[in-house]
């Protein structure tokens, strides 16, 4: 059932990275508009992106309230210029999204190597602790704040002069590795959530090499 010339949304997809979360759908609207509803923790439906002609809606503000909650959204279709109009059954056409649990499903963004510092034959490599839009006590939490020890960084490193790689891991944001004196090394990191079965790993960070800006050398 539904209003004449109004089509239901389809292909509802959550796109989420480091908790920045957007619901996307199809089709591009023709003579219709969309409104999104998302279920809160009380199972009430909250209206978002009312009367939009976009095919996406940023739901970050809602999902960061509790990243462990399992959310459901739906996209309502209305004739253009009449957001109150309903279908023959007294309701607008709508389509439900898949369920979405931010903690388990948000993609890990590409990490960044913040700095590296060499002291003798040791190098300290620091990964930037990216800020998320998740809040606690009016403060934005970092990725490490949210995931704690459930976030591991894997470091790949190799001599600039050779192809043989080594790896190390940390459940903090710092690595302390042994290097050969007088050799330049390159570094790349990857984030991993060990407890997950999908969306476990980020893409690799950009490669950073010693002898470039980010590093510091001390005897």
């Amino acid at each position: 059932s539904g209003t004449t010339n109004t089509v239901a949304a389809y292909n509802l997809t959550w796109k989420s990275t480091n908790f920045k979360t957007i619901l996307e759908w199809e089709p591009k609207p023709v003579n219709q508009v969309y409104t999104v509803q998302i279920s809160d923790r009380s199972r009430n439906w909250k209206y978002k992106c009312t009367g939009t002609t976009d095919t996406e809606c940023d739901l970050t503000d809602e999902i960061v309230k509790d990243v462990n909650w399992t959310y459901e959204a739906r996209v309502l279709s209305y004739p253009a210029g009449n957001v109150e109009s309903t279908g023959s059954a007294g309701e607008p056409l709508y389509e439900n999204s898949p369920e979405f649990t931010p903690y388990l499903e948000t993609n890990l963004g590409q990490p960044t190597i913040q700095s590296f510092e060499q002291v003798g034959t040791k190098v300290n490599v620091t990964v930037e602790d990216e800020r998320t839009l998740v809040r606690r006590n009016n403060t934005f939490l970092s990725l490490r704040d949210v995931f704690g020890k459930d976030l591991i960084y894997t470091l790949y490193y190799w001599k600039s002069s050779s192809s043989g790689k080594k790896t190390a891991k940390t459940n903090t944001n710092e690595f302390l590795i042994d290097v050969d004196k007088g050799e330049n090394y390159c570094f790349s990191v990857q984030a991993v959530i060990p407890s997950r079965t999908v969306n476990r790993k980020s893409t690799d960070s950009p490669v950073e090499c010693m002898g470039q800006e980010k590093g510091e050398f001390r005897e």
């Epitope: 190390a168 891991k169 407890s195």
Partner: antibody, heavy 117, light 107 residues
Framework: QVQLVESGGGVVQPGRSLRLSCKAS????????MHWVRQAPGKGLEWIGL????????IYDPKFQGRFTISADNSKNTLFLQMDSLRPEDTAVYYC??????????WGQGTPVTVSS | DIQMTQSPSSLSASVGDRVTITCKAS??????LNWYQQKPGKAPKLLIY???SLADGVPSRFSGSGSGTDYTFTISSLQPEDIATYYC?????????FGQGTKLEIT
């Protein structure tokens, strides 16, 4: 359920090559790091190396670098170990294992390789 | 490279005994240490991860402790089914290294 099944082992002459396979089911290998470990008869476990199948990054114990090559075919959900210039001391049971980053949580049953003339 | 020294290489104990195995790393491995049990002809089985955490489905008589370079694996009350070889594994940095193994027998 998660399963790893190795194959390709057997008897091979010194100096020859052998390619072992590890077929995964119940998960996508590209979501994990994957390892090869071996065990010579009556001896302990020995780590060979790992691959991140998603980006092809490989890490080896230096003693195997250059002679052994780990690769993966994500479309077939299969891990490989190419072993070249085999020696009698490479005689062992070869295991593949899945790594969740805190531990190796699943292992194959192992495939035996005998290097002998 | 990090060396793992596991001791003893073998030990004999009675049912009900408390059994302890140690692994010493040549440098700080920051608790990235696992303990595995292996029975003849079988693949290793995870018992303890991150030095102290008990793997799912593993009886509570198994435990792990330690940090830095020194780690201990304990069976609080040895059972007949615990007859196996036990290995530690450090995976904090490559090359990953196993201890030499401890073969446990019942007297």
């Amino acid at each position: 359920q998660v399963q790893l099944v190795e194959s390709g082992g057997g008897v091979v002459q010194p100096g020859r090559s052998l390619r072992l396979s590890c077929k995964a089911s119940g998960f996508n290998i590209k979501d994990y790091y994957m390892h090869w470990v071996r065990q010579a008869p009556g001896k302990g476990l020995e780590w060979i190396g790992l691959i991140d199948p998603e980006n092809g990054n490989t890490i080896y114990d230096p003693k195997f670098q250059g002679r052994f090559t780990i690769s993966a075919d994500n479309s077939k959900n299969t891990l490989f170990l190419q072993m070249d210039s085999l020696r009698p001391e490479d005689t062992a049971v070869y295991y593949c294992a899945r790594d969740n980053s805190y531990y190796f949580d699943y292992w194959g049953q192992g495939t035996p390789v005998t290097v002998s003339s | 490279d990090i060396q793992m020294t596991q001791s003893p290489s073998s030990l004999s104990a009675s049912v009900g005994d408390r059994v302890t195995i140690t692994c010493k790393a040549s440098q700080d491995i920051r608790k990235y240490l696992n303990w595995y049990q292996q029975k003849p002809g079988k693949a290793p089985k995870l018992l303890i991860y991150y030095a102290t955490s008990l793997a799912d489905g593993v009886p509570s008589r198994f435990s792990g402790s330690g940090s830095g370079t020194d780690y201990t694996f304990t069976i609080s009350s040895l059972q007949p089914e615990d007859i196996a070889t036990y290995y530690c594994l450090q995976h904090g940095e490559s090359p990953y290294t196993f201890g030499q193994g401890t073969k446990l027998e019942i007297t």
